[in-house]
């Protein structure tokens, strides 16, 4: 569940989680 930065009614900012994958897995070893 990614959220986007914005302003809510109580003037708190929403942190943008959009820079990170929602269900990350470990990088494959090559």
């Amino acid at each position: 569940s990614e959220t986007t930065t914005g302003t809510s009614s109580n003037s708190s900012q929403s942190t943008s989680n959009s820079g990170l994958a929602p269900n990350p897995t470990n990088a494959t070893t090559k």
Epitope: S12, S14, T15, S16, N17, G19, A21, A27, T28
Partner: antibody, heavy 115, light 112 residues
Framework: EVQFVESGGGLVQPGGSLKLSCAAS????????MDWVRQASGKGLEWVAE??????????YYAESVKGRFTISRDDSKSTAYLQMNSLKTEDTAVYYC??????WGQGTLVTVSS | DIVMTQTPLSLSVTIGQPASISCKSS???????????LNWLLQKPGQSPKRLIY???KLDPGIPDRFSGSGSETDFTLKISRVEAEDVGIYYC?????????FGGGTKVEIK
């Protein structure tokens, strides 16, 4: 204004423990995925740990270098994230930043591990 | 782990001139949802890092539009169309597609 304020850093001997805190304000903390990132003096950035939000079951992730020694946690009622650091090593010496999923960042707290 | 390689290591730019930083990842950053989790951050001298761009090209709120990001898969670029004095610092690319999250080594931008 969004603020993340870290505290709890200091000087500790190898093998010792510290608990870092990150108090958030001006942000909907309960929605934030919280990370700790560290930076040794004059070096680059290294990700340490992450804890996600309630809809994501507060799942946690750790860097291999701290797995089994560090524990990330959060208290949404206090808008605070924590990093419990045990069995500290000299190579853990760094400024530790808390960040909301790499979006907002705190000013950092210095952890020095030395005998 | 995904290795993030930035070039150049440092960059000396005249105010008003453009600047470009390259970031290459050792594996594709394209995630299964079709999004690419490549971020750019700036750490100004004596300050904590600040994110400029996420998902390759999306500017964070309050970031001037002289900054732009592009690229796909493993090759990414940050461009500053006209460098200003306040742009000095160390720029980092960072991938958020696969654990562990990893950062590039940084590119130091200074003014000539």
């Amino acid at each position: 204004e969004v603020q993340f304020v870290e505290s709890g850093g200091g000087l500790v001997q190898p093998g010792g423990s510290l608990k870092l805190s990150c108090a958030a304000s001006g942000v909907t903390f309960s929605e934030a995925w919280m990370d700790w990132v560290r930076q040794a003096s004059g070096k680059g950035l290294e990700w340490v740990a992450e804890i996600r939000d309630k809809p994501n079951s507060y799942v946690t992730y750790y860097a291999e270098s701290v797995k089994g020694r560090f524990t990330i946690s959060r208290d949404d009622s206090k808008s605070t994230a924590y990093l419990q650091m045990n069995s500290l090593k000299t190579e853990d010496t760094a400024v530790y930043y808390c960040t909301g999923a790499m979006d907002y960042w705190g000013q950092g707290t210095l952890v020095t591990v030395s005998s | 782990d995904i290795v993030m390689t930035q070039t150049p290591l440092s960059l000396s730019v005249t105010i008003g001139q453009p600047a470009s930083i390259s970031c290459k990842s050792s594996q594709s950053l394209l995630y299964s949802n079709g999004k690419t989790y490549l971020n750019w951050l700036l750490q100004k001298p004596g300050q904590s890092p600040k994110r400029l761009i996420y998902q390759v090209s999306k500017l964070d709120p309050g970031i001037p539009d002289r900054f732009s990001g592009s690229g796909s898969e493993t090759d990414f670029t940050l461009k500053i169309s006209r460098v200003e004095a306040e742009d000095v610092g160390i720029y980092y690319c960072m991938q958020g597609s696969s654990l562990p999250w990893t950062f590039g080594g940084g590119t130091k931008v200074e003014i000539k």
